[in-house]
């Protein structure tokens, strides 16, 4: 294309082509003609004396690029009840739907919208949600490694560490937190048979622990005296 700006339509010089981005070559007219901008379509093609005539796309229709389309494209149908609309249908872009929380996209469209959402898998007790996702976006579960646990069935909960106890009553395992012995002024005087209920872990107070490979000894072991449950809070 010559260096100077040339108004369409024009006949390209030998060895030159039309500007690809905003022009097209009309074989019938044998001219370089203007494409229509995003949001419009070709109402009338060009001829040797007059350029392309463009018109706005109608409601629920769009064109996203400079084009020589005879009609605008139809926007995708409305998002389903398990989806959220993250981009509305306009004259210049298609509607984009994404899966609501707790679901993943099992079938994507070429435009990046989601055609079919599926409920995320849940990881059961002893398993936590892995930091990476499956190729299809579903949750991956991983077994809680020693020193960590998950006592929930969830698509979001990760394995978290056992609490560190001042006095440990029952060691934690992959599906339960460590149980700490409660503080009592009489503990040192009374041999203790443990009836310690499992504290309900909460998001705001994950736990502390220390570990090692244990062949879990008898839970009725005498526990020594005095201590307090030391809980911890998640940093940040």
């Amino acid at each position: 294309v010559p260096a100077q700006v040339v108004l369409t339509p024009y006949k390209p010089e030998p060895g030159y082509e039309c500007q690809i981005s905003q022009e097209y070559y009309d074989r019938k007219a044998q001219m370089c003609c203007a494409k229509c901008p995003p949001g419009q379509y070709v109402k009338h093609f060009c001829n040797k004396t007059s350029d392309t005539v463009c018109a706005d796309c109608e409601a629920s229709m769009y064109t996203q690029v400079w084009n020589q389309f005879r009609t605008c494209l139809s926007c995708s149908s409305s998002c389903t009840t398990d989806q959220v609309e993250i981009r509305a249908c306009t004259k210049q872009q298609n509607r984009v739907c994404a899966c609501e929380a707790g679901r993943y996209c099992a079938l994507k469209t070429h435009s990046g919208s989601c055609r079919q959402c599926m409920r995320l898998s849940k990881c059961g007790p002893g398993f936590g949600v892995a930091s990476s996702r499956a190729p299809n976006g579903n949750v991956l579960c991983k077994a809680c490694a020693p020193g960590t646990f998950s006592d929930t069935t969830s698509s979001t909960d990760v394995c978290r560490p056992h609490r560190i106890c001042s006095i440990l009553a029952i060691p934690g395992n992959a599906s339960t937190d460590a149980v700490c012995a409660p503080e009592s002024p009489t503990l040192s005087a009374i041999p203790r048979t443990l009836y310690v209920s499992q504290p309900e872990p909460t998001r705001s107070q994950p736990l502390d622990q220390e570990p090692g490979p244990s062949q879990t000894p008898s839970i009725l072991t005498s526990l020594g005296s005095t201590p307090i449950i030391e809980q911890s809070t998640k940093g940040g």
Epitope: P161, I164, Q209, S225
Partner: antibody, heavy 129, light 110 residues
Framework: QSLEESGGDLVVPGTSLTLTCTAS?????????MCWVRQAPGKGLEWIAC????????TYYASWAKGRFTVSRTSSTTATLQMTSLTAADTATYFC??????????????????????WGPGTLVTVSS | ALVMTQTPASVSAAVGGTVTINCQAS??????LAWYQQKPGQPPKLLIY???YLTSGVPSRFKGSGSGTEYTLTISGVQCDDAATYYC????????????FGGGTEVVVK
């Protein structure tokens, strides 16, 4: 709860020494690992070994400490660290520290979360001629 | 052998400022990382475990983060009492990997 080390001394190279860690306010046999960590003057921390204080008394050592250092549980409230063939490089404050155990299911012989949450004040061992 | 590389060796901060200490493991330790604070003449104190969990009584100005081989301790709103040496520790021990401490970072508060 507290831990206290004893037995630190000035000894000559080539000799042996036994350090004792005494627990107060809790029973060593209650699901704890008792560990030893040392710190040379003005230097960083160096893990030595741990012993599972319950029944089996399983131990694990830093590779450099195997053979020369031995941990054991002598009672429900005491653990010891025996050190042999001492050299000047062993001069350090020796701390005992504890970490608690957990069930490991299939993870036989594996210890992961060795978090030392309770420490003694330390005892100084000086090896010098 | 697992090596924990801690940087910087020393850092100075004004009261109210922020201190960042980095710890790099020579292999993936899967968040099994602890941070300790040690003051002269005292034993270390466990501040943070499993990379980001604060132990009981530790002020919320201490924050641990990181995963894999890279970990960070951040102290926001530094106070005079925070002057100490801080150590990271890989709490990952297995049949072929030993727990190891970083070299320490001295925090000086101006």
């Amino acid at each position: 709860q507290s831990l206290e080390e004893s037995g630190g001394d000035l000894v000559v190279p080539g000799t042996s020494l036994t350090l004792t860690c005494t627990a107060s306010g809790f029973d060593l046999s209650s699901f704890y690992y008792m560990c030893w960590v040392r710190q040379a003057p003005g230097k960083g921390l160096e893990w030595i070994a741990c012993i599972y204080a319950v029944s089996s008394g399983s131990t694990y050592y830093a590779s450099w400490a195997k053979g020369r250092f031995t941990v054991s549980r002598t009672s429900s409230t005491t653990a010891t660290l025996q050190m042999t063939s001492l050299t000047a490089a062993d001069t350090a404050t020796y701390f005992c520290a504890r970490h608690q155990s957990y069930e490991t299911y299939g993870y036989v012989g594996v210890v992961y979360a060795t978090y030392f949450s309770l420490w003694g004040p330390g005892t100084l061992v000086t090896v010098s001629s | 052998a697992l090596v924990m590389t801690q940087t910087p060796a020393s850092v100075s901060a004004a009261v109210g400022g922020t201190v960042t200490i980095n710890c790099q493991a020579s292999e993936d330790i899967d968040s099994y990382l602890a941070w300790y604070q040690q003051k002269p003449g005292q034993p270390p104190k466990l501040l943070i475990y499993y990379a980001s969990y604060l132990t009981s009584g530790v002020p919320s100005r201490f924050k641990g983060s990181g995963s894999g081989t890279e970990y960070t301790l951040t102290i926001s709103g530094v106070q005079c009492d925070d002057a100490a040496t801080y150590y990271c520790q890989s709490a990952f021990y297995s049949n072929n990997t030993e727990t190891a401490f970083g070299g320490g970072t001295e925090v000086v508060v101006k």
